[in-house]
């Protein structure tokens, strides 16, 4: 018996079709994905094979202007007129908190939506029974295939998921279910889930009883053969894992942002048992057209983005300096504001011990395109954000040690002057440079803000500690020549979407003053420009 | 917190009629699929009618093609299964349940959700 899992993972709100880098679209021509190309290729591939699922691993939320204004009503919308067939629960379905998961989502998608490893307490037991489920079993053809959902059990860290749900470990929350399948004489296992690739593996060695492994959240890019496009294969796919019980466990992941179609084709014998695997993901490009029923749908929806763009956010009351001139050479406001957003972004008490998991924040000058003119009123929109902020970046929390952050620090002023971008804004953190000094040594000074203690104060680095730091996306993948950081990094956890980071805090600030205040400094007067 | 509650069973002449109901609390029904069971004493529970959740496609096992109609009412959230020509083999406790999936089906383990069941008697 053969089945086909199409699957996506962390499309983050790439409804409509984007650049090859999965920004916004500019040249139609060379687009990618987006849901009316998707469902041209999921219709054809239902229309030629007999026995299809098309799964999605989390991460649906969060990352451009749909999910600010629909706030996930979108998703739900499009991802019924696709008929998806499950969903696992990525950590950002919880950004805004769990009304936000409950009310556009899970009460209104027609498809199950599952995590095995959330177990809801309190009064929000009762209120969100039934809306997910740890498992479930769907009719295919003749058969029935079992689906066991999963969800990194780190997003009380990473998004906004309240006190009233916990986050078990995978492999301990997915056992009993699995077996509880099998009570069912369920014999075709698929574990759905959004832990990373690690994670994935894990599973598949660990769990008895599981047979293949779709992942998300790590954007794990798997390719047998020749890759069509830029992303480089982390490995084959499917990847095989040897389960502990000596069984060849497929795992696959598609990448994100719908770029690709995940397409796995699963032979099983008649217990259930895989005979084999392959497949590879299939590059949403335009040889494959528009659906024309759901780009008009999109078309429809759209109308809102415009409008949104356009209303005032918040004020500011200050000239906000995002020129070249200032932030690639010294202390910024736009930087501070940028990064005092971020920080604030990520505020979760999750621990008694410390007034917030993470107190600092980088960013490069090279990232922030375009002051803020306060002579409009002081009038700030989400259009003048995108001036600002134009790649369709993320805000991304990171694990470091002190050693690195050095690097990266001496990185950042290594040829000072020549206006290049990688010079770098800072929240939590207070710099001195010494540019009389050599490349490489002109760091003299690097103190960072505290996170075990009540009252934050600026402590030395401390070159082996582990610190937790918020940054674009950008450089944790090496930009602007920050090798040090892709290559050091201990964590790396996918955030929010730049623009929308900083369009809520000014927001909910309402009136904006941020100042040049001391964090970055120079001795021997080497900042004149 | 998800309940489906049956009625209208009870105990009918061959080749009478009966209606029953199965509604639903604790979701919108418009998003299930709800499915009819059967279960006859000393043999396995079976399908017998199903309705999907957009209301698009109904399905009946072969023994009650012609016999059965399912519908549903989504404003007040209750699926009905009206019984014609009823035969003495239709006697058997008759359950509903309930899936968040858009297709029908007659396995009983895809269905998440289920009622308490309500007996039917056909017999003279």
């Known amino acids: 018996w053969e089945l086909t899992i199409l699957h996506t993972n962390d499309v983050h709100s790439r409804l409509e079709q984007t650049s090859e880098d999965s920004s916004k679209c500019v040249n139609a021509s060379r687009c990618m994905g987006g849901v009316a190309r998707l469902f041209t290729k999921v219709q054809q591939i239902r229309r030629a094979e007999p026995n299809v699922l098309l799964l999605d691993a989390g991460d649906q939320y969060q990352g451009t202007i749909w999910f600010t204004v629909y706030k996930g009503a979108e998703v739900a919308h499009f991802m019924n007129a696709l008929r998806y067939d499950a969903m696992a629960l990525g950590n950002h379905e919880f950004d805004n908190g769990v009304e936000g998961l409950i009310e556009p989502l899970l009460k209104e998608a027609k498809f199950p939506i599952l995590s095995a490893n959330i177990k809801a307490k309190g009064p929000l037991a009762s209120q969100i029974s039934g809306l997910y489920l740890p498992y479930k079993v769907l009719p295919v053809g003749d058969e029935v295939v079992g689906i066991v959902g999963y969800t990194s059990k780190e997003t009380p860290f990473l998004s906004n998921p309240g006190t009233n749900l916990v986050f078990e470990d995978e492999i301990t929350a997915l056992q009993p279910e699995v077996d509880k399948l099998k009570t069912l004489n369920v014999n075709k296992i698929i574990a759905l889930g959004h832990s990373g690739f690690e994670m994935d593996k894990l599973i598949a060695q660990k769990v008895r009883g599981v047979d293949v492994v779709v992942g998300g959240h790590s954007n794990t890019f798997l390719y047998t053969g020749n890759p069509p496009s830029k992303e480089v294969p982390a490995g084959k796919y499917p990847f095989i894992v040897t389960s502990d019980d000596g069984r060849k466990v497929p795992v696959v992941q598609a990448y994100a942002f719908g770029k690709y179609l995940g397409y796995l084709k699963i032979e099983f014998d008649e217990r259930g048992n895989v005979i084999s695997s392959h497949g590879n993901p299939i590059l949403l490009n335009s040889s494959i057209p528009e659906d024309p029923s759901i780009k008009a749908d999109i078309n429809k929806w759209r109308i809102k983005l415009d409008n949104y763009s356009t209303q005032e956010l918040g004020k500011t009351i200050v000239y906000l300096d995002g020129s070249s001139q200032s932030c690639r050479f010294r202390e910024c406001n736009m930087g501070n504001l940028i990064c005092d957003a971020m920080i604030n972004n990520n505020l979760r008490h999750t621990d008694e011990m410390f007034w917030n998991h993470v107190s600092m924040c980088i960013l490069n000058g090279g990232g922030i395109r375009s002051p803020i003119d306060e002579r409009n009123n002081g009038t700030i929109t989400w259009e003048n954000l995108a001036a600002v902020l134009p790649f369709g970046g993320t805000f991304d929390l990171v694990q470091l040690k002190g050693s690195t952050l050095k690097k990266a620090f001496e990185h950042s002023v290594h040829r000072y002057g020549q206006s290049t971008g990688e010079f770098l804004q800072v929240g939590g953190i207070h710099v001195v440079y010494d540019l009389s000094r050599k490349p490489g040594d002109r760091v003299v000074k690097l103190d960072v803000l505290c996170t075990k203690c009540r009252v934050p104060s600026y402590d030395p680095l401390k070159m082996d500690e582990v610190y937790k730091v918020i940054l674009p996306n950008f450089l944790a993948n090496g930009g602007d020549g920050f090798q040090m950081i892709k290559d050091e990094l201990l964590r790396h956890d996918s955030g929010d979407q730049d623009i929308n980071v900083v369009s809520t805090y000014i927001s909910k600030m309402k009136v904006i003053y941020p100042a040049v205040e001391g964090r970055i400094k120079f001795s021997h007067h080497h900042h004149h420009h | 917190q998800v309940q489906l509650q049956e009625s209208g069973g009870g105990l009918v002449q061959p080749g009478g009629s009966l209606r029953l109901s199965c509604a639903v609390s604790?979701?919108?029904?418009?998003?299930?699929?709800i499915g009819w069971f059967r279960q006859a004493p000393g043999k396995e529970r079976e399908g017998v009618s199903c309705?999907?959740?957009?209301?698009?496609?109904?399905n009946y096992a072969d023994s009650v093609k012609g016999r059965l109609t399912i519908s549903r009412d989504n404003a007040k959230n209750t699926v009905y299964l009206q019984m014609n020509s009823l035969k003495p083999e239709d006697t058997a406790v008759y359950y509903c349940?309930?899936?968040?999936?858009?297709?029908?089906?007659?396995?009983?383990?895809?269905?998440?959700?289920w009622g308490q069941g309500t007996q039917v008697t056909v017999s003279s």
């Open positions: 349940a309930a899936q968040r999936y858009y297709y029908c089906s007659d396995k009983v383990e895809v269905y998440d959700y």
């Open positions: 604790g979701f919108a029904l418009d998003y299930y699929t």
């Open positions: 309705i999907s959740s957009s209301g698009g496609s109904t």
